[in-house]
């Protein structure tokens, strides 16, 4: 990546690391107003099956793993990259490496959910206050969770899907910031590891992952006012490991593995066509992104 | 039934190539990651490579990292392991193995082996 | 890497014979250790996995056992077919390591 100061734009999706081939210290980021991409200064260590995030209009990188034909080291780091400066600065280290990890924010706070050291499956969560640059872990998980898919809605956490150690899951828990508890909600229609997690207009959507047996290319939704999950329109590409974020009221799916190849694709979902069109494709292909929009 | 059937081995020159397969039967490769070990002759047991079926992620010991490539087609049920720039020390029976989640931890299935020999 | 230390590295017992086996690894690798049991010119077969669960269709006088770091494999009463070499391995980390093997041989 380039160490230039990054142009001042409005909103951008920020792709940090991912894999193929070995992990990798990629920072992109995709403007969606004019299909543009911009090279991005390097992640410190390169990185796969790591968590994006924005918090006051600087990005954060959380966990992962470096793969590498120099070996395979989960991470518990947490990097800040400053768009104004183009720059990375390290932050103070999570408890635990967590690979395949989930976050969330809530009120400015970082909360990072499962993920695996070697072949511990977490079910511990704790949280990232930036103002004091310090991490204290909060209840734990009902379920151990890697590749979980995370999201904030109503300022309640939802931890959805993953790989406890034995079994791909469907089921999901939610995390009630003021009780410092956990309880289950209703279980997806599908089995989904590495599937991509977000909100749009108050409900929680699943897109793709692994099933235990195949990639997956359905989409389904939560409401948390019927606490029932509904099938959307299926994505073009079956894909798991894949990138999620919202931007401007449509959802954007970036890369994965759909079995056989590391995408490139960039989908978009209309939740008012109910449509997912191709809209872009990285500069190459890869899974385990870290993927987060840039504040107005 | 679960089988696994190794082929490909056979008698190449250092610094040659070989592509080793991995035919499975009674069960879906998408559906475990499968692992090579080798063997060298007289000796013990050496892990070689693994594939994840959920991220696409691999891994290689370092003493292959580099060299060898390990790869899945699911729509023949068949994995791979491409051996370049090959060296004497990697002369050893290679057998593919499945990795179960139940049992936890551990390979559950092995192949027969494929014999590589390196020599001029 | 992690290093699995296996002893001995052979043995001589007699039918009927209790026999133990020991790993030690170089670091904390929890539960994650199997055991395989692998006869000349075949390939290994799981005995143990998650250091002391017997798999499917293996005899019940195998067993495992872990003591922190240390990993024992018995056989309570040796049989015929139980003559071969015996294998740890463990799977907290990758990449994964075997232990240098265990000849148990006739007396």
């Known amino acids: 990546g380039s160490m230039g100061h990054a142009p001042k734009v409005g909103r951008l999706i920020y792709t940090a690391g991912g894999y193929f081939r070995q992990s990798l210290s990629y920072l992109e980021a995709y403007n969606p107003s004019d299909g543009t991409w911009l090279d991005l200064a390097d992640l410190q260590v390169p990185r796969s099956g790591l968590a994006g995030c924005v918090v006051g209009g600087l990005l954060y990188a959380v966990g992962g793993r470096n793969n590498s034909p120099d070996g395979n080291t989960d991470s518990s780091a947490l990097d800040c990259y400053n768009p104004m400066t183009n720059q990375w600065s390290p932050c103070a280290p999570m408890s635990v490496p967590r690979n395949r990890i989930g976050v969330g924010v809530i009120d400015g706070h970082i909360y990072a959910v499962g993920g695996s050291h070697g072949c511990i499956h977490h079910n511990s969560v704790e949280r990232y206050e930036p103002e004091r640059d310090e991490w204290h872990l909060v209840a734990p998980m009902l379920t151990r969770r890697i590749g979980v898919g995370v999201a904030v809605l109503n300022r309640l956490l939802y931890a959805v899907g993953g790989f406890d150690g034995t079994n791909r899951l469907n089921s999901a828990e939610c995390y009630y910031p003021e009780r410092n508890e956990w309880r289950m909600i209703t279980a997806m229609n599908t089995i989904r590891s590495g599937a991509g997690v977000c909100v749009l207009h108050n409900c929680i959507y699943a897109a793709g992952g692994y099933d235990g047996q195949d990639q997956l290319n359905s989409v389904e939704r939560y409401d948390v006012e019927t606490e029932t999950w509904t099938f959307v329109a299926p994505m073009k590409h079956r894909r798991s490991a894949l990138g999620i974020t919202v931007h401007q009221g449509r959802i954007y799916v970036l890369g994965g593995y759909d079995g056989h190849t590391f995408l490139d694709s960039v989908e978009c979902y209309d939740p008012d066509t109910d449509t997912w069109s191709e809209v872009t494709r990285m500069t190459s292909g890869r899974s385990g992104v870290g993927v987060a929009v840039t504040m107005e | 039934e679960v089988q696994l059937v190794e082929s490909g081995g056979g008698l190449v020159q250092p610094g040659g190539s070989l592509r080793l397969s991995c035919a499975a039967s009674g069960f879906a490769i998408s559906a475990s990651s499968i692992h090579w070990v080798r063997q060298a002759p007289g000796k013990g047991l050496e892990w070689v490579a693994s594939i994840d079926p959920e991220t696409g992620e691999t891994l290689y010991a370092k003493s292959v990292a580099g060299r060898f490539t390990i790869s899945a087609d699911t729509s023949k049920n068949t994995a791979y392991l491409q051996m370049n720039s090959l060296r004497a020390e990697d002369t050893a029976v290679y057998y593919c193995?499945?990795?179960?989640?139940?049992?936890?931890?551990?390979?559950?299935?092995w192949g027969q082996g494929t014999l590589v020999t390196v020599s001029s | 890497d992690i290093q699995m230390t296996q002893s001995p590295s052979s043995l001589s017992a007699s039918v009927g014979d209790r026999v133990t086996i020991t790993c030690r690894a170089s670091q904390s690798v929890s539960s994650a250790v199997a055991w395989y049991q692998q006869k000349p010119g075949k390939a290994p077969k799981l005995l143990i996995y998650?250091?002391?669960s017997l798999y499917s269709g293996v005899p019940s006088r195998f067993s495992g056992s872990r003591s922190g770091t240390d990993f024992t494999l018995t056989i309570s009463s040796l049989q015929p077919e139980d003559f071969a070499t015996y294998y740890c391995?463990?799977?907290?980390?990758?990449?994964?390591?075997f232990g240098q093997g265990t000849k148990v041989e006739i007396k």
């Open positions: 998650s250091a002391s």
């Open positions: 391995q463990q799977s907290y980390s990758f990449p994964s390591t």
């Open positions: 193995a499945r990795w179960g989640y139940e049992p936890y931890m551990a390979m559950d299935y």
